[in-house]
Structure formats: structure tokens, C-alpha cells
């Protein structure tokens, strides 16, 4: 079995303010078991956007049903985009751990740009 890769196929996504952004992410393997998280930015100051395992993220929905067997699509939609949402988003696979899951592999990132709503 080849080691899991996290694929973010879009380097750039441009969305109008007020619209919904779709950020695509797929994994290439079911192994290792563990959740996906999405972050804006990198490093210790990164902002958590979505955590499959726990938390409440009212603006975020998943494109696929994550409970379904063989699912490797971890794309998300973020609603009601504003200019403050601009930045680079990373899809990160975690490996099941005890007591805490461990970061395993990150996608290359998708840069979200927001254009002003047409007047």
C-alpha cells in the first residue's frame, strides 16, 4: 500500500463576496485512520476552519458524506465569503492517536481570493 497523499488540486480559488467557496481535497488512501482538519494559514498561528472529529463550524459543510464507506473526499464549502476570509487553506490528515490524534500529512494549500461583490 502506498503512503497516503493529500491532494488539493486547486492552487487558487476566486470567489465573490457573499458567495460560497468550495475548497477541494482528496486523500489517496484509507490508511491511516484518522480525521481531516482544515486550517487557514500555516504554522503555530494557523486558524482552524473545520475539524471532522469535533467542534461546531456553522459556515462550513462537507461536499461528501464523511461517514460513508471508502470516502476519501474531504472537500468543504464555506458560505457567505467576505474579504476577511482570504488566505491559504490547508487540508490536513491526522492519524488516530492516544490520547490525541497526530498530524500526519498536509495538502499543498489552496489560496482563496475574494473579489468585491459587484455593485
Amino acid at each position: 500500500e502506498e503512503e497516503l497523499q493529500v491532494i488539493q488540486p486547486d492552487k487558487f480559488v476566486l470567489v465573490a463576496a457573499g458567495e460560497t467557496a468550495t475548497l477541494r481535497c482528496t486523500a489517496t488512501s484509507l490508511i491511516p485512520v484518522g480525521p481531516i482538519q482544515w486550517f487557514r494559514g500555516a504554522g503555530p498561528g494557523r486558524e482552524l476552519i473545520y475539524n471532522q472529529k469535533e467542534g461546531h463550524f456553522p459556515r462550513v459543510t462537507t461536499v461528501s458524506d464523511l461517514t460513508k464507506r471508502n470516502n476519501m473526499d474531504f472537500s468543504i464549502r464555506i458560505g457567505n465569503i467576505t474579504p476577511a476570509d482570504a488566505g491559504t487553506y490547508y487540508c490536513v490528515k491526522f492519524r488516530k492517536g492516544s490520547p490525541d490524534d497526530v498530524e500526519f500529512k498536509s495538502g499543498a494549500g489552496t489560496e482563496l481570493s475574494v473579489r468585491a461583490k459587484p455593485s
Epitope: L30, I31, Q52, G55, T67, K68, R69, N70, K96
Partner: antibody, heavy 119, light 110 residues
């Protein structure tokens, strides 16, 4: 940390019903399947059924399809397993278990609920 | 339905020696490039604990003396050097279709 806390031991008469609860914490309840497994005294493991709390999709072992019903209460992150028309050979420890990888496996287990069926 | 048959039903192994438990499926459990076999350890009075998933992947925190192998219909759980705390009943489970368990193998110290 994932925890599954099950209801206490039950003693039932033949022909009665029992409803065992499993309260989940430490994760988003609707993102992971819950399985129910039983173990008669001194015997092996027997899979009963599974439920996806996000949409109440269920799969049942044919042996239990007519007597078991799985439900969830997403407001309290609790799963339930009801078994009807109890017989003495239903005496067993009943376990709930969470499937962390949507692999139809059992990653995290409750401590079990002993159900005794005796006249 | 796929039936899993474990062998032996019980075995006794000396401390530090290798223990091998087999699980045979009545038909192939391989699908979508994965072997849908899992191994659990159950100690007396405790719930089972997942050891190996998808035939050969150790679960989090499982010592590396435990390993899983096999493909198709024949699978093996190996404990490379038996420790006293490994005394337990071991179960295989498949999820190629809806889950079923093997009958269990009781492992004791010789």
C-alpha cells in the same frame, strides 16, 4: 478523548424488551457510525447492527433484524439499542462501539451493559 | 454471508516465543484494493480492543510485536515475542460485507 458510557445492568423476563443506551462524548456524534455487539457468557462476539447518526441509516445482522431497533438522539449524543421478545439466550453483555474510519470496524468501545433474561 | 474460521481455538506459548493465530474467510474479503480484516484483543472483564485494521495496519498505541498479514481469504495475527500481558482472547472480524467475527482464539502462557 472519545468516551462511550453505557447504561446500567438490566434484568428482564422472557418476552419483555430492553433498551440499552450509549452516551458519546469527545467527538462529533453525527460524523461516525455506532455499532452494537453482544457477548453471551463465556462466548464470542456477535455483531448486532450499526447506525449512522447523521441520517439514521442502519444495517442489521439478519439474525436480529426483526427484534432489534437502533436509534439515536443527536441532541444528547446518545445511541440506543432496543431488543424485543427477549429469550434466555439473549443474556449477554451488550457493547456499543464507534467506527473512527468508516471501515465498518470498532475503534472505541463502551464498557458494556449486562442484560440478564430470567423468569 | 462470509464466515470467518479461526485456528487454533486455543494455544499455549512460552514467554518470549512467537504466537501465531490464523483466520480463514469463506470467500475473499479483498475489495477496492484493501483486505477488510481486523483483529481485536479481549482481556477478561474488558471490552475488546482494536489491534490491527485492514489486515496489516497496527492501531494507535499497539506494540510493534503485534503484526497482521495475509490477503484474500487467509490472514494471520503474529505476536513476535509473547509477553504476560498478551494473555487474552483474540478475534478476527471482516467488513467486506456487513461485519462478522471469528469464533475467537484463547492465548495462554505455556
Amino acid at each position: 478523548q472519545v468516551q462511550l458510557v453505557q447504561s446500567g445492568a438490566e434484568v428482564k423476563k422472557p418476552g419483555a424488551s430492553v433498551k440499552v443506551s450509549c452516551k458519546a462524548s469527545g467527538y462529533t456524534f453525527t460524523n461516525y457510525w455506532i455499532n452494537w455487539v453482544r457477548q453471551a457468557p463465556g462466548q464470542g462476539l456477535e455483531w448486532i447492527a450499526m447506525i449512522d447518526p447523521s441520517d439514521s441509516e442502519t444495517h442489521y445482522n439478519q439474525i436480529f433484524k426483526d427484534r432489534a431497533t437502533l436509534t439515536t438522539d443527536t441532541s444528547t449524543s446518545t445511541a440506543y439499542m432496543e431488543l424485543r421478545s427477549l429469550r434466555s439466550d439473549d443474556t449477554a453483555v451488550y457493547y456499543c462501539a464507534m467506527d473512527y474510519g468508516s471501515l465498518y470496524a470498532m475503534d472505541y468501545w463502551g464498557r458494556g451493559t449486562l442484560v440478564t433474561v430470567s423468569s | 454471508d462470509i464466515v470467518l474460521t479461526q485456528s487454533p481455538d486455543s494455544l499455549a506459548v512460552s514467554l518470549g516465543e512467537r504466537a501465531t493465530i490464523n483466520c480463514r474467510a469463506s470467500q475473499s474479503v479483498r475489495s477496492s484494493g484493501y483486505n477488510w480484516i481486523f483483529w481485536y484483543q479481549q482481556k477478561p472483564g474488558q471490552p475488546p480492543k482494536l489491534l490491527i485494521y485492514l489486515a496489516s495496519n497496527r492501531d494507535s498505541g499497539v506494540p510493534d510485536r503485534f503484526s497482521g498479514s495475509g490477503s484474500g481469504t487467509d490472514f494471520t495475527l503474529t505476536i513476535s515475542s509473547l509477553q504476560a500481558e498478551d494473555v487474552a482472547v483474540y478475534y478476527c472480524q471482516h467488513s467486506r460485507e456487513l461485519p462478522t467475527f471469528g469464533q475467537g482464539t484463547k492465548l495462554e502462557i505455556k
